[in-house]
């Protein structure tokens, strides 16, 4: 029974997207009165794990020495104090990459594009998948997330960009996934560098490091344009 105790804080170290085989630590932080910590994983018998608190008792560590498919999923944690169990933490979604072979990322008509023109990034998988993600290198979130309408399996997804500006320049990768577990992603594609050359009206600025797509309205690199791609995939913002 969840009591009036404040909910604990749950996070993953080094972060919540982990490559297959790499280590990750899940931390649950409660209060100094905590006597025990419990970690629950969605769709697994509860509790998934229990740990005694580390001194000074306000934190517990759940170690995953080698990431596999079994660990990917949605977690919540609780702590027990002398007055009962806490409310659940906010969920932690632990994603594993490397579950499937890497897709291929290409640019049509070319990765060299003039500012103001259009380009489409094409992510292709060898086996049919129903979800494709596009990321800009070192960005904290996928730029676009394409999922098929009715779970239909696709070999590719198109990510149109129009009109292209200097902000679109940079290195991109894509991932593919099956809808039955969006916590399992493929290996990343090889990187694709998109080079945007300036026009007379839009001189190319000096190169800068790629920035997160959430940098502000003027820095949003991928505004969805045009109709739904021919692949039959629906476009979603992450």
């Amino acid at each position: 029974q969840a009591g009036p105790l404040p909910k604990p804080t749950l996070w993953a170290e080094p972060g919540s997207v982990i490559s297959w085989g790499n280590s990750v630590t899940i931390w649950c932080q409660g209060t100094l009165e905590a006597r025990e910590y419990r970690l629950d994983k969605e769709e697994s018998p509860a509790p998934w794990d229990r740990q005694n608190p580390l001194e000074p008792k306000n934190k517990a560590r759940f170690s995953i020495p080698s990431m596999t498919e079994d660990y990917a999923g949605r977690y919540r944690c609780y702590y027990r104090s002398p007055v009962g169990w806490s409310q659940p933490s906010d969920p932690l979604e632990l994603v594993m990459t490397g579950a499937y072979s890497k897709p291929t990322l290409s640019a049509l008509p070319s990765p060299l594009v003039t500012s103001g023109k259009s380009v489409t990034l094409l992510c292709q998988s060898r086996s049919p998948m129903d979800t494709f993600l596009l990321i800009k290198e070192r960005a904290a979130h996928p730029l676009l997330h394409l999922r098929s309408e009715h779970g239909a399996q696709q070999h590719q997804a198109e990510f149109p960009m129009s009109p292209v500006t200097s902000v679109h320049g940079g290195t991109y990768r894509c991932f593919s996934s099956h809808g039955f577990s969006h916590y399992l992603l493929s290996h990343p594609s090889d990187p694709l560098e998109l080079i945007v050359s300036g026009s007379l009206e839009d001189p190319r600025p000096s190169p800068t490091r790629s920035v997160s797509t959430a940098a502000g309205p003027e820095d949003q690199p991928l505004m969805p344009t045009g109709s739904v791609p021919h692949s039959g995939l629906r476009r979603h913002w992450e």
């Epitope: 804080t9 749950l10 996070w11 170290e13 080094p14 972060g15 919540s16 997207v17 982990i18 490559s19 085989g21 790499n22 280590s23 630590t25 931390w27 932080q29 906010d90 990459t97 993600l133 990321i135 290198e137 070192r138 960005a139 904290a140 979130h141 996928p142 990768r173 991932f175 992603l185 990343p188 490091r209 920035v211 997160s212 959430a214 940098a215 502000g216 820095d219």
Partner: antibody, heavy 123, light 108 residues
């Protein structure tokens, strides 16, 4: 453009405390861990710890457990590090650096660094 | 904690020369979590190579990185004046994050 702007140099007396700030701009503050790194004069880099601004989760190098306290103010996208009971050994340049919490390539490298804050402990 | 040992501590190279520096870990490190930073005097470190072999944005193609397990290296195919700096390797395979002692690269 991503920027981490740190507070200015500090001259403090032994035994005192100091609080350094690091204001982030150009990205979503809560999507990146903020790490803190120490560099003594002419020496290598030492990791102090991190804070995950989204929920305040922290991890420390045990060596700095009782030396440093990391906090954030989400409303101003600012991270803070307070150093306690300062001695001459704490004289150094301190950097904040951000690493993505959702790193799809899985590297968790420190992408962006502040310009550094020099702390001098002297009586 | 994982100790990273860089060698040599100081090296000098002529312009156009091929340069290799190494980073040896006291225990095995995932290649995903091994990075290199460049630092010039009076400046902050910059991410230079991440996950062993990926060049950070803006890093010239003459740089490359390789390795696995306990042995990693950074190579410059043809030394240029702007490459003179200190290079640090860094791991986050296991907490605490640790850095190597650095290799200072000078122009001969």
């Amino acid at each position: 453009e991503v920027q981490l702007q740190q507070s200015g140099p500090e001259l403090v007396k032994p035994g005192a405390s100091v609080k350094i700030s690091c204001k982030a701009s150009g990205y979503t503050f809560t999507d990146y861990n903020m790490d803190w790194v120490k560099q003594s004069h002419g020496k290598s880099l030492e990791w102090i710890g991190y804070i995950y601004p989204n929920n305040g989760g922290t991890g420390y190098n045990q060596k700095f457990n009782s030396k440093a306290t990391l906090t954030v103010d989400k409303s101003s996208s600012t991270a803070y590090m307070e150093l306690h009971s300062l001695t001459s050994e704490d004289s150094a340049v301190y950097y904040c650096a951000s690493s993505p919490y959702y790193d799809y390539v899985g590297s968790y490298a420190m992408d962006y660094w502040g310009q550094g804050t020099s702390v001098t402990v002297s009586s | 904690q994982i100790v990273l040992t860089q060698s040599p501590a100081i090296m000098s190279a002529s312009l156009g020369e091929r340069v290799t520096m190494t980073c040896t870990a006291s225990s095995s490190v995932s290649s995903s979590y091994l990075h290199w930073y460049q630092q010039k005097p009076g400046s902050s470190p910059k991410l230079w190579i991440y996950s062993t072999s990926n060049l950070a944005s803006g890093v010239p193609a003459r740089f490359s990185g390789s390795g696995s397990g306990t042995s990693y290296s950074l190579t410059i195919s043809s030394m240029e004046a702007e490459d003179a700096a200190t290079y640090y390797c860094h791991q986050y395979h296991r907490s605490p994050r640790t850095f190597g002692g650095g290799t200072k690269l000078e122009i001969k």
